[in-house]
């Protein structure tokens, strides 16, 4: 069912351009052009495209999620399951998702069973990694081609709205009949959009997009698009650093920068600022970095780790350009993400037997393995972690006790709140809480706390939301087949009778409630069915999710040309060093903690289960020291003023790939090869670009005057205005007459 032919590949570029003007689809339709430079083989492209040259879209950002089973839509190609309340499945209507939440999933905040084995960091890592590999964009509040409903205002199923209906007896005082729900955007030319291509049929059902690269590539740190990557990098440093917060520091350590002022302010404002209803969110490789403090903490940790590695690599290889340092540090950070996920995280989730069965040892790159994240994985299976989220944010002092000044916060108090970190003692108290406090154990009759089902808060929304109902509704929106179809897909027996269900779900009351609601086992939503299953031995998922997560992880590993264990990616010495590293070491290197557990995912008591950072092994970067052969005619490459070069090899010959620093453009040859006579061409030149002359994308806001400088530009403000944090907008300096 995994197609390599894109639905639009057969169309001419002229026709595509016409359609693009109507639909905005062009960027996603044109097959990516894969550069044939040795650099393309050395560092992964930011979009994930061209990882597999036979299937350049596999795993790339802004492509459709993979289908492991065909979707099930009510009209055969686009309408979600449950769209028409009278539509019967196996003789019964599907239960409203909110009813399922209320009767099966939701428990009060006080009902939490602590995981006796794993720390809250295990939960946080799962969410963080999910945000590395998948983000499904939603339709905007208006449908793409006019006439669309505003989903905040309607309780009718009217594209792009698929509201979550509330039962009459359980509506808030205001009497709202529904919770808003926006359908995920259709991949270009699928479902209803097939009409544009004359292909409105069940053979071209609605597909959903992944806005991120599927690959485990630390896109949480670096982004999944060139535009975002540009925003994230510090272009003035010679060390290939990432941008950090310009003003605020955490005991000398960096914070994430804020989004630029031009971006919509979608987070909670700084406390004590009168009249402010919203403030900026953190800027990171994934837009959800401010969602919850645990997620912000990991984004911050890896920003620091990149900058630490970049500085160390530059000190080791002074001849490296800023770009080379950036790419090498990015490569190491990406490898660490892969190692921590596949070596430390996934085996805990699947259990050793299922890990062996579905993932197994690495046997090298497989060009037939499609690494594209599957719809069922991102929409259902990997959302198992929502049932492990503790309703409290715990912040601990240096003795790993409840912090006297920083009491535990209910989760809803910390949603989209950068100031929880910035004004809450910084990163260390949060990291201590994640290390030394247990995750919530996923128990069949305690699946999700009210913090997530009653008080989930998004500033763009007028009311609170319900994560459990959203997950169920999202599965239906995406046309995911039911629980039994997926069990069959995984080679597990279908569950036909209540007794069958009781073998999979030990809690008789939960199994009975599920059947009371769904009436037929085939109708059970896959997220709920998988979530409620008994855990496999030494696992935190049941057999269905272990299968789906395992298959996905194997595909992400085996189908990734840049996987850290693939022989061309690192030297043997570098691989040996990388293996020594761990999340505990990353914490030691980038926080004020001096004692950590040897295994960051194992919940431990302080101090007895904590080790001194001195005894936590890590990689020795000596393995990254670059030396040049003394016997070739080329010698040390010539540097180019205002430009960089990166070394790579092609057919056993040294190659230099030049690039110009930000604000300069290349003139001459981009790539030089070492021959027996020396370099085959003269190095190129880097000429200054006059950014101020760019009328299409003016670098300064209209409030500022632009002045060209060598390699850049300056935005100037007239008194009494001053330059804002973004360096482009003039803001009130506080001296304007009131």
């Amino acid at each position: 069912t995994q197609q390599s032919q894109h639905p639009t590949d057969a169309l001419s570029e002229d026709l595509l351009s016409i359609i693009a003007n109507m639909s905005g689809c062009l960027p996603y339709m044109l097959p990516p052009k894969c550069p044939n430079t040795c650099l393309a083989n050395k560092y992964r492209p930011i979009t994930g495209a061209c990882n597999n040259r036979d299937h350049p879209r596999w795993g790339a950002s802004n492509t459709a999620l993979a289908r492991w089973l065909p979707p099930v839509y009510e009209d055969g190609f686009s309408q979600p399951r449950g769209w028409n309340p009278g539509f019967l499945y196996n003789g019964f209507p599907l239960p409203p998702v909110r009813e399922v939440t209320r009767h099966v999933i939701q428990v009060s905040n006080e009902v939490v069973t602590d995981d006796d084995r794993y720390s809250d960091l295990l939960m946080a890592w799962g969410q963080y990694i999910d945000h590395d590999i998948a983000f499904t964009p939603q339709s905007t509040s208006k449908a793409a081609f006019g006439g669309g409903a505003d989903c905040q205002m309607t309780c009718e199923n009217q594209n792009p709205c698929f509201p979550i209906q509330l039962p009459e007896e359980a509506r808030p005082a205001a009497g709202t009949a529904c919770l808003p729900f926006y359908r995920s955007s259709a991949a270009c030319g699928t479902g209803d959009q097939g009409a544009l291509f004359g292909n409105l049929s069940t053979a071209n059902p609605r597909q959903q997009m992944n806005g991120l690269t599927s690959f485990l590539d630390a896109s949480t740190v670096y982004g999944s698009s060139p535009a975002l990557e540009r925003q994230l990098r510090n272009w003035t440093s010679a060390e290939g650093l990432l941008r950090v917060h310009a003003r605020l520091r955490d005991s000398g350590r960096a914070y994430l920068p804020f989004v630029p002022p031009r971006a919509p302010a979608a987070c909670a404002p700084e406390p004590g600022i009168p009249g402010e209803t919203r403030g900026p969110c953190f800027l990171a490789g994934d837009g959800r970095a401010s969602e919850v403090p645990s997620l912000t903490a990991l984004h911050t940790l890896w920003l620091r780790e990149h900058n630490r590695l970049a500085a160390a690599l530059k000190a080791l290889n002074a001849h490296w350009s800023a770009d080379a340092v950036y790419q090498e540090a990015r490569k190491v950070v990406g490898a660490l993400h892969q190692i921590i996920t596949l070596r430390d995280y996934i085996p805990r989730i699947l259990g050793p037997e299922a890990f062996q069965q579905y993932v197994g040892p690495y046997e090298g790159y497989d060009s037939t393995a499609n690494p594209t994240v599957s719809n069922v994985f991102s929409t259902a299976a990997f959302r198992f972690g929502h049932a492990t989220i503790h309703p409290l944010v715990r912040r601990l002092d240096a003795s790993f006790q409840e912090h006297p000044d920083l009491p535990g916060l209910w989760l809803h108090q910390a949603f989209f709140s950068p100031w929880t970190l910035l004004r809450g003692g910084g990163l260390d108290p949060l990291i201590r809480g994640l290390l030394a406090r247990p995750a919530k154990l996923q128990v069949q009759d305690q699946l999700m706390n009210e913090e997530l089902t009653e008080r989930l808060f998004v500033l763009s929304n007028s009311s609170t939301l319900d994560l459990a109902s959203i997950n169920l509704q999202r599965g239906r929106d995406h046309g995911l087949p039911g629980y039994n179809e997926w069990r069959e897909f995984c080679g597990l027996p279908r569950l036909e009778t209540p007794a069958d269900l009781s073998t999979a779900i030990a809690s008789r009351s939960v199994a009975d409630k599920i059947l009371d609601l769904y009436k037929h086992p085939d109708n059970i939503d896959v997220w709920l069915g998988g979530l409620a299953e008994n855990f496999l031995p030494r696992a935190r998922t049941g057999p269905l999710f272990a299968c789906l997560i395992g298959k996905q992880m194997k595909a992400l590993r085996d189908g990734d040309w840049f996987w850290w264990e693939n022989s061309h990616v690192f030297t043997d010495a570098q691989r040996r060093e990388l293996e020594k590293h761990s999340l505990s070491r990353v914490i030691c290197d980038n926080t004020g903690l001096t004692r950590v557990p040897m295994d960051a995912f194992q919940v431990g008591k302080f101090p007895e289960d904590f080790e001194s950072c001195d005894s936590i092994t890590g990689m020795n970067l000596e393995a990254w020291r670059e030396t040049f052969p003394q016997d070739d005619k080329c010698g040390f490459p010539e540097s180019v003023e205002n430009g960089d070069f990166v070394h790579c090899e092609e057919s056993g010959r040294r190659v230099l790939v030049y690039s110009c620093r930000h604000g300069y453009e290349l003139q001459g040859r981009e790539q030089l090869t070492c021959t027996q006579e020396g370099w085959d061409f003269q190095p190129p030149l880097c000429k200054d670009v006059n950014e101020c002359a760019d009328g299409a994308h003016p670098p300064c806001h209209a409030s500022a005057r632009c002045r060209n400088t060598k390699g850049g530009f300056q935005c100037l403000c007239a008194d009494p205005y001053e330059l804002g944090d973004d360096g482009r907008t003039c803001v009130d300096s506080g001296r304007l007459p009131r």
């Epitope: 019967l88 003789g91 209540p498 069958d500 008789r508 009975d512």
Partner: antibody, heavy 119, light 107 residues
């Protein structure tokens, strides 16, 4: 309305096979399990097994395993139950009955097919 | 296999009486029991599903209760057409066993 129409009475010799049909009308045939139940003269009801017509999946009582086959032809909304290796004690009325799920009561029954095994 | 035991196996009553038939399961079957009525020479008719859900068209004098291992069928104010054989059945686990039946006769 919902109806199940079974094939006519059969007389078979021991060791032979019998194939009984059950044609459904008045409902979405594929969405409902079809069960087969038999009743020997003067005895109680005995469940033989079920078929899920849309998938062709079946489940049988252990007693009939290996002797019974259930199939469906969705184009004509018909299910079949074949019992092989007939014995004298297989003499019974064979009913098809439908239910919206495997475990809710059988709410619609066929009129029954009398199968007599005699030499 | 799950065993269903019904009592009594036969019962005599008069028009207007109330009768109760009980059924025991050999293990917990939650509420997955059904009750059928069978007139001589006819196919069985479903009266009650899921222990207590009355089928449409079935008179309200019939009622079912119970869960776990113990279930009852109660018929209030017996009518002439109620004299028949009654079967309970479990649909919790396969095979879906019936009990031996209770023959309700006119006294």
């Amino acid at each position: 309305q919902v109806k199940l129409l079974e094939s006519g009475a059969e007389v078979k010799k021991p060791g032979a096979s019998v194939k009984v049909s059950c044609k459904a009308s008045g409902y979405t045939f594929t969405g409902h399990y079809m069960h087969w139940v038999r009743q020997a003269p003067g005895q109680g009801l005995e469940w033989i097994g079920w078929i899920s017509p849309n998938r062709g999946a079946t489940r049988f009582a252990q007693k009939f395993q290996g002797r019974v086959t259930m199939t469906s032809d969705t184009s004509i909304n018909t299910v079949y139950m074949e019992l092989s290796g007939l014995r004298f004690d297989d003499t019974a009325v064979y009913y098809c009955a439908t239910t919206r799920t495997a475990y809710y009561g059988m709410d619609v029954w066929g009129q029954g097919t009398t199968v007599t095994v005699s030499s | 296999e799950l065993v269903m035991t019904q009592s009594p196996s036969s019962l005599s009553a008069s028009e207007g009486d109330t009768v109760t038939i009980t059924c025991r399961a050999s293990e917990n079957i939650s509420r997955y029991s059904n009750w059928y009525q069978q007139q001589p020479g006819k196919a069985p008719k479903l009266l009650i599903s899921a222990a207590s859900t009355l089928q449409s068209g079935v008179p309200s004098r019939f009622s079912g209760s119970g869960s776990g291992t113990h279930f009852t069928l109660t018929i209030n104010s017996l009518q002439p057409g109620d004299f028949a054989t009654y079967y309970c059945q479990q649909t919790y686990s396969s095979p879906f066993t019936f009990c031996q039946g209770t023959k309700l006769e006119i006294k």
